[in-house]
């Protein structure tokens, strides 16, 4: 159901100062400028809805241009506690403290927030990504070392009058960007405390947040070019489905990935691609400007709606799931990576999904909204879409009841 009822002042409208406050690209993450400490130290911070720690580089590292120098901040307070965060590949560890934090192109407020000062890391920082830390925007349940460490957004809402909601517009370029282009280009917007009408077209459709840890949602149906994958919907959410700006790909559970690839292969069979392409190990290239978008299917994910037995669908184009790769063989070619991959931890709706949509993380009402992004990449024949309502029965059965564990994701 669309959400057009009146809301409290400041909740909707224009947030000019926050529009275009993100930089980056799907492969290396989107970042916002933040300041930490007194006097303020400016850092670029990865926006990650798949984790819950605010963590910044706090020691020299070959991939960092700058880092948080706690000794230079008069407002830094040491919590005398360490934190260690391992990922599937890589890790970071550091020391916990608090300091004053603000977002220059965000709400005009300063908050005291928990900060993990990263002193050691492995395969965490990305060479050339231009970010020096991570802003985990998910819930306290998955914060490290435990859920007693209040996440940044919780602190922001508690200490200010900022409404408990943020929205993201991630703008994929549709073509590879070199380092200087990334610095000069618009990467999108993070609207803190509201929704900006100018960033989307059509209506916003909302899906419930199933549980407040990750931003967990329920997928009830998947279609490739309108053809139902016809799987038990529990498979789509095994063991969870999350919306994660810190992950590049659309990641799917093994069985779902295999069925989806089989269907995408069949739909695009006018051209044959090596297995390595479907596994994300090889790029496929075309002479510049000749990418045959039309041979690739659209992918629709149906999400549980806010009303009983009602769902809506979000549809992405190949322009979202074929990710342009910089550093290609030559500028004569347009090369792409297949940005759908296999997952052992459930469905992850990463940047390639989010780049099609304006996504509203309405924490206050425990729901996530989707609308067609005003900046999504499309062609003259097809566009990303958010459509509904559809009648879908027994949607509650699509959720998987996971044994409780503690895990987090980042740009995989």
């Amino acid at each position: 159901e669309t959400d057009e009822e009146p809301e409290e002042p400041g909740r909707r409208g224009s947030f000019v100062e926050m529009v275009d406050n993100l930089r980056g690209k799907s492969g290396q993450g989107y970042y916002v400028e933040m300041t930490v400490g007194s006097p303020p130290q400016t850092l670029n911070i990865l926006v990650d809805t798949g984790s819950s720690n605010f963590a910044v580089g706090a020691a020299p590292h070959p991939f960092l241009h700058r880092y948080y120098q706690r000794q230079l901040s008069s407002t830094y307070r040491d919590l005398r506690k360490g934190v260690y965060v391992p990922y599937t590949q890589g890790k970071w560890e550091g020391e916990l403290g608090t300091d004053l934090v603000s977002i220059p192109h965000g709400p005009n407020v300063t908050v005291r927030a928990n900060i993990a000062a990263i002193t050691e890391s492995d395969k965490f920082f990305i060479n050339g990504s231009n970010w020096e830390g991570i802003l985990g925007l998910a819930y306290a349940e998955i914060a490290r070392p435990d859920d007693s460490l209040e996440p940044f957004f919780d602190s922001l809402v508690k200490q200010t009058h900022v409404p408990n909601l943020f929205s993201l517009q991630l703008c994929g370029a549709g073509f590879p960007l070199n380092q200087s282009e990334v610095l000069a280009s618009v990467g999108g917007s993070m609207i803190i405390g509201g929704i900006d009408h100018s960033l989307y077209t059509g209506s916003l459709w909302y899906t419930p947040i199933r549980r407040e840890w990750y931003y967990e949602v329920i997928i009830v149906r998947v279609e490739i070019n309108g053809q139902d994958l016809k799987m038990d919907c529990k498979e789509y959410n095994y063991d969870k489905s999350i919306v994660d700006s810190g992950t590049t790909n659309l990641r799917l559970p093994k069985k779902v990935f295999e069925a989806a690839v089989k269907s995408i292969k069949a739909a695009s069979s006018t051209e044959k691609f090596p297995d390595g392409f479907w596994l994300g190990e090889q790029l496929v290239c075309w002479q510049a400007g000749t990418t045959p978008w039309n041979i690739f299917p659209v992918i629709s994910l149906y999400l549980m709606g806010e009303v009983t037995n009602q769902s809506f669908r979000i549809t992405i184009l190949p322009q979202q799931y074929l990710r342009p790769v910089e550093d290609v063989a030559t500028s004569q070619d347009d090369c792409y990576k297949f940005a759908i991959s296999q997952s052992s931890t459930g469905t992850v709706m990463g940047a390639v999904i989010m780049e099609g949509f304006y996504v509203v993380f309405d924490r206050a009402r425990k729901r996530i909204g989707f609308a067609v992004s005003a900046c999504h990449v499309h062609d003259e024949f097809r566009t990303a879409a958010v459509e509904g309502p559809f009648v879908t029965l027994d949607m509650e059965d699509c959720g998987y009841n996971i044994p409780q564990t503690d895990e987090s994701t980042l740009m995989t």
Partner: antibody
Amino acid sequence: EVQLVESGGGLVQPGGSLRLSCAASGFNFYYSSIHWVRQAPGKGLEWVASISPYSGYTSYADSVKGRFTISADTSKNTAYLQMNSLRAEDTAVYYCARQPTHYYYYAKGYKAMDYWGQGTLVTVSS
Amino acid sequence: DIQMTQSPSSLSASVGDRVTITCRASQSVSSAVAWYQQKPGKAPKLLIWWASSLYSGVPSRFSGSGSGTDFTLTISSLQPEDFATYYCQQYSYSPFTFGQGTKVEIK
């Protein structure tokens, strides 16, 4: 702009050694194969050796196996051809050429050597 | 090693002529054949890759065909700048062997 620049050629006595360099720019060196191809005066093209920096795979023509060694320094985007035990029949213009590896699949297949350097002359004579 | 036998070794033709050069591999090389053009004192230039794909910037009068063992380079209407030596090369198996070349001269 893609560029391959060879250097290191010159006059050397039979049995001597020489190291050729191929400095690359304007493309992803790591995911390319670098080939050395030579051309004796008035003759056709002869493939000599190749290296794929990302896999470390090297390959040689029978005529140079055991005498020539191809290598690459990815930090410098440079490939090298170390030539030992040189013979008169090794006299030629040596070209380095670039080929996208199988990391790049072109919708119609795999590309060939699409960029070449200007060549460097190696003369083996007493 | 795979031998690439190119024919003819030379040919004389006039501007506007249709020219065909053939190359035969001693065993199947799938479609992994390239054609290069070389002018005196210059490096070779790629014309055709994967047997029939025209390389970017190469005039459409050049075309390639064939697969397996038999391959053809065709110049539909010879232009003055096309007088050069042409080489086929297989890149299916190492060593990547070249044909001996075909010199296209002015009649």
